[in-house]
């Protein structure tokens, strides 16, 4: 079910760790970039199922924390579940770790219906029904 990184980046050159010094360690077949590990999963799941899948691999759904440090993500195509959810009580958006979305992290497009979000490309996220099926991106710190 794993998707290789090259097609996700639409045949653009993959940023490799050797150019930036050592990066890692990451689980086998995960991508290391700026000391974070990423994996793109091709299997379509609901948001909750995707979250559970990441947790089972000691990771969490994608969090955007820095456009500069996660620059390769601007090349991602298609739509993938990320770790951003709307809090029903006040309508605000926060990451899985409880931190609030800051609008310099990414553009949140709230035109579609939903209280979960998919990552598109160029640091744009789109609201979506959490029960919909999507591919997903897991992320963890390299230790």
């Amino acid at each position: 079910f794993k998707e290789t990184f090259q097609p996700v980046l639409c045949n653009k050159e993959v940023p490799v760790s050797s150019r930036e010094g050592y990066c890692g360690p990451c689980p086998n077949n995960w991508i290391c970039h700026r000391n974070n590990c990423y994996q793109f999963f091709n299997e379509e799941k609901t948001w909750n199922q995707s979250q559970a899948s990441c947790l089972s691999q000691n990771s969490s759904l994608l969090k955007i924390y820095s456009k500069e440090e996660q620059d390769f993500l601007k090349l991602v195509k298609s739509y993938h579940w990320m770790g951003l959810v709307q809090i029903p009580a006040n309508g605000s958006w926060q990451w899985e770790d409880g931190s609030s979305l800051s609008y310099n992290q990414l553009t949140l497009v709230e035109i579609p219906k939903g209280s979960c979000a998919v990552y598109g490309s160029s640091f744009k996220a789109y609201t979506e029904d959490c029960a919909n099926l999507n591919t997903y991106i897991c992320m963890k710190r390299a230790v």
């Epitope: 553009t107 497009v109 579609p112 219906k113 939903g114 998919v118 598109g120 919909n132």
Partner: antibody
Framework: EVQLQQSGAELVKPGSSVKISCKAS????????MHWIKQQPGNGLEWIGW????????EYNQKFSGKATLTADKSSSTAYMQLNSLTSEDSAVYFC?????????WGQGVMVTVSS | QFVLTQPNSVSTNLGSTVKLSCKRS????????VNWYQQHEGRSPTTMIY?????PDGVPDRFSGSIDGSSNSALLTINNVQTEDEADYFC??????????FGGGTKLTVL
């Protein structure tokens, strides 16, 4: 008041290209998606693609990939669509539209006629 | 990718109530918003209903939108139909991100 002013009707020859424009006013052009829609008589509305002028990001309906190219000029708040290798199947009215959380705004449409 | 299916044409009497349907082929109709557009011959479409049931300023309250989960359809209801309501009506929802999907349209004839 939001307005989308499109360029005039076009009569073009098969095999050629055409570039039509959509000038936006009354809102922040860079931070809104601009979509393009094709309408042929009796054929309903077909989504061609969108452009996000803020960063030039685009997405296309697979059917129009290679047929349409979307661009935008932030300085003039104008979106453009180029259609290439035109055939009679491309004869249609083309709309630019701004889809928002609220009402959708439509340009007046550009009639493109492909004829030798 | 799902399809939105609308009846090709509907006829109704002046002053009556008519319901126009928009059926989603796969997936839940409620999982994304539905917008409705009216298009008179030779004109651009205009928004009649957005986000399932909201009416833009200037649209008569004779027009209302709803979601019918049992038939997996969106409905546009027009009460007290007037001659100026004779037009084509299109429903629209979203597939991925903000990519719109349109129904084929319904031609409403007022008798």
């Amino acid at each position: 008041e939001v307005q989308l002013q499109q360029s005039g009707a076009e009569l073009v020859k098969p095999g050629s290209s055409v570039k039509i424009s959509c000038k936006a006013s009354g809102y922040t052009f860079a931070n809104n998606f601009m979509h393009w829609i094709k309408q042929q008589p009796g054929n309903g509305l077909e989504w061609i693609g969108w452009i996000y002028p803020g960063d030039g990001d685009t997405e296309y309906n697979q059917k129009f990939s290679g047929k349409a190219t979307l661009t935008a000029d932030k300085s003039s708040s104008t979106a453009y669509m180029q259609l290439n290798s035109l055939t009679s199947e491309d004869s249609a009215v083309y709309f630019c539209i701004r889809l928002t959380e609220g009402t959708t705004y439509w340009g007046q449409g550009v009639m493109v006629t492909v004829s030798s | 990718q799902f399809v939105l299916t609308q009846p090709n044409s509907v006829s109704t009497n002046l002053g009556s109530t008519v319901k126009l349907s928009c059926k989603r082929s796969t997936g839940n109709i409620g999982s994304n918003y539905v917008n409705w557009y009216q298009q008179h011959e030779g004109r651009s479409p205009t928004t009649m209903i957005y986000r399932d049931d909201k009416r833009p300023d200037g649209v008569p309250d004779r027009f209302s939108g709803s979601i019918d989960g049992s038939s997996n359809s969106a409905l546009l209801t027009i009460n007290n139909v007037q001659t100026e309501d004779e037009a084509d009506y299109f429903c629209q929802s979203y597939s991925r991100g903000v990519s719109p999907v349109f129904g084929g349209g319904t031609k409403l004839t007022v008798l």
